[in-house]
Interface confidence: low
C-alpha cells in the first residue's frame, strides 16, 4: 500500500495473507467459513510451491494468538483468466477446514447487486504489499481510502486505453494506492466487499494509471457455484 | 503475438549429441516455467523436461528416459530455451516441441516442433 | 511413475453424438499444494497439440462449453456434448502433479 498508513490490529478480520513456501505473495479476502478470495495471476508458477493461506494476523513476522496458517485443499481460478489479460482475475482458494472464527477472523460479506459503485465514493483497500517505489515490504498491515473514480476517465487513452471492462472498477492513484504483494485483496466500500486488487504489473502511485479491481458483483454466479 | 520457434532438429547417429533452441517471443519469457515435449512418429506424447523461471531457482525435471543424458537450460537474457541432448539413442528420434507452461496449467503455448532423427 | 490408462484408444462417433472419453491414474494426483494438475489436450491432424481443460473441469480460454471434465482421485473424463467436425483428433490425458510428469496413450476421435 503507498501512501497509507497502519491498519488497526485485527479490525479486518476479513484480510488474509496468501502465502507460498512461507512467504506472503498477495492479499486474500475471507469471504465463507472455508473460501478465501483473490486474484488469480497470484499463483504464477507457484505449481511446486506449498500454498497456504493465514487468517487472523496483523504483523506476518510476530506471534499473534489469533494467527493461524491454513493449508489449502483446492484453488480455483476463474475458468476464463489468461496468464496475458487482467480480465477475470479471480481465485477461490478452499481452506482445509473451517476457520476457527473470532473477533480477528470473520467473513465479509461481499457485493451481489451488479451496480456500478458511484464515482468518489472513498473505499478501503488493505494489504502487506510493498510500501514504497524502493520495494519496502511492511510486516504489520497497512491500508488507504480511496475514492472510487469512473470508468469513463479510468478508460482514456492517458490512462487505461480502454482496457476497463464492465467487470472491472478503478480507484484513484494519486501518490495513494494499492502495489505489488496487495493483489488479491480486499476493495470494501460501506462494509462490504466490492472489488478485488487485480495482479497485474502496473505501476503504483501514478494517478494517470488508477488501481484496477474486479468487480465481485459480476462474478457472484461463479463465486456461488463454486462455493456451493 | 505469443510465440515458439524451435529449430536445431536433424539427423545424428547413435551416441551423437545435438543442442535443441527454442526462439520465444510476445510474452514475458523470464516469468514462465518452460518444458520440452516429444513425440515419436505415430506415436503419443511424451514430457521431457521441465525448467523454473530465475524466481524458483531455475530448478529443472526430467523425464526418467532421458535424466542424465539431456540438460534444459534457458537464457532469459535472449528469451531462448534449450535442451542439450548427448548419448543420443535411436529411440530419442521424435518431434520436439517447445512449450510454456502457464498458471494453473502446464502447456498453454506450444512450438510447431523440430525434428530429431536418430540413425546410423 | 504415475502410469496414465486411456479408454477407449479409438472412439467412432457421429457428427452431433456425444463423446465420452475416460483417463484413470495409477495413484492419486493430488498435489501437495491442493491442486489436481489433471488435463486433457487435442492434437488435431498435423498440427501441435492445444490445451482444452485444467485443474481436472476448467474450460482452457476459448474452449467451446460443449467439451467438460469431471473426475477426482484417480478417475476422470472428458465429455463433449455434440461433436464437431473440428473435434476430431487425438485426445491425451496428462498428469501434471508429480514428477515425471506423464500423458495418456491418447484416444482418437473419428468418424464413424
Known amino acids: 500500500i503507498l501512501g497509507g498508513r497502519e491498519a488497526e490490529a485485527h479490525a479486518r478480520p476479513y484480510m488474509a495473507s496468501v502465502q507460498v513456501n512461507g512467504e506472503h505473495l498477495c492479499g486474500g479476502v475471507l469471504v465463507a467459513e472455508q473460501w478465501v478470495l483473490s486474484a488469480a495471476h497470484c499463483l504464477e508458477d507457484a505449481a511446486d510451491g506449498k500454498v497456504q493461506v493465514l487468517l487472523g494476523a496483523h504483523s506476518l513476522s510476530q506471534p499473534e494468538p489469533s494467527k493461524r496458517l491454513y493449508d489449502v485443499l483446492r484453488a480455483v481460478p476463474h475458468p476464463d483468466s489468461r496468464p496475458d489479460t487482467i480480465d477475470h482475475d479471480l481465485l477461490l482458494l478452499q481452506l482445509s477446514e473451517k476457520a476457527t472464527l473470532g473477533p480477528a477472523v470473520r467473513p465479509l460479506p461481499w457485493q451481489r447487486v451488479d451496480r456500478d459503485v458511484e464515482p468518489g465514493t472513498l473505499c478501503d483497500v488493505a494489504g502487506w504489499g510493498i510500501v514504497s517505489h524502493a520495494g519496502r515490504r511492511p510486516d504489520r498491515l497497512q491500508h488507504v481510502l480511496l475514492p472510487v473514480l469512473d470508468r469513463a476517465t479510468c478508460n482514456r487513452r492517458t490512462h487505461h486505453d480502454g482496457a476497463i471492462t464492465q467487470r472491472m472498477m478503478c480507484a484513484e492513484s494519486n501518490r495513494r494506492d494499492s502495489c505489488k504483494g496487495d493483489s488479491g485483496g480486499p476493495l470494501v466500500c460501506g462494509g462490504v466487499l466490492e472489488g478485488v486488487v487485480t495482479s497485474g504489473s502496473r505501476v503504483c502511485g501514478n494517478r494517470k494509471k488508477p488501481g484496477i479491481y474486479t468487480r465481485v458483483a459480476s462474478y457472484a454466479a461463479w463465486i456461488d457455484s463454486v462455493l456451493a | 503475438e505469443v510465440q515458439l520457434v524451435e529449430s536445431g532438429g536433424g539427423l545424428v547417429q547413435p551416441k551423437g549429441s545435438l543442442k535443441l533452441s527454442c526462439a520465444a517471443s510476445?510474452?514475458?519469457?523470464?516469468?514462465?516455467?518452460m518444458n520440452w515435449v516429444r513425440q515419436a512418429p505415430g506415436k503419443g506424447l511424451e514430457w521431457v523436461a521441465r525448467?523454473?523461471?530465475?524466481?524458483?531457482?531455475?530448478?529443472?525435471y526430467y523425464a526418467d528416459s532421458v535424466k542424465d543424458r539431456f540438460t534444459i537450460f534457458r537464457d532469459d537474457s535472449e528469451s531462448m530455451l534449450y535442451l542439450q541432448m548427448n548419448n543420443l539413442k535411436t529411440e530419442d528420434t521424435a518431434m520436439y516441441y517447445c512449450?510454456?507452461?502457464?498458471?494453473?496449467?502446464?502447456?498453454?503455448?506450444w512450438g510447431t516442433g523440430t525434428t530429431v532423427t536418430v540413425s546410423s | 511413475d504415475v502410469l496414465m490408462t486411456q479408454n477407449p484408444l479409438s472412439l467412432p462417433v457421429s457428427l452431433g453424438d456425444q463423446a465420452s472419453i475416460s483417463c484413470r491414474s495409477s495413484?492419486?494426483?493430488?498435489?501437495?499444494?491442493?491442486?489436481?494438475?489433471l488435463e486433457w489436450y487435442l492434437q488435431k491432424p498435423g498440427q501441435s497439440p492445444n490445451l482444452l481443460i485444467y485443474?481436472?473441469?476448467n474450460r482452457f480460454s476459448g474452449v467451446p462449453d460443449r467439451f467438460s471434465g469431471s473426475g477426482s482421485g484417480t478417475d476422470f473424463t472428458l465429455k463433449i456434448s455434440r461433436v464437431e467436425a473440428e473435434d476430431l483428433g487425438v485426445y491425451y490425458c496428462?498428469?501434471?502433479?508429480?514428477?515425471?510428469?506423464?500423458f495418456g496413450s491418447g484416444t482418437k476421435l473419428e468418424i464413424k
Open positions: 495413484q492419486s494426483i493430488v498435489h501437495s499444494n491442493g491442486n489436481t494438475y
Open positions: 512449450v510454456r507452461h502457464g498458471y494453473y496449467w502446464y502447456f498453454d503455448v
Open positions: 525448467i523454473r523461471s530465475k524466481s524458483n531457482n531455475y530448478a529443472t
Open positions: 485443474n481436472v473441469f
Open positions: 496428462f498428469q501434471g502433479s508429480h514428477v515425471p510428469y506423464t
Open positions: 510476445g510474452f514475458s519469457f523470464n516469468t514462465y516455467a
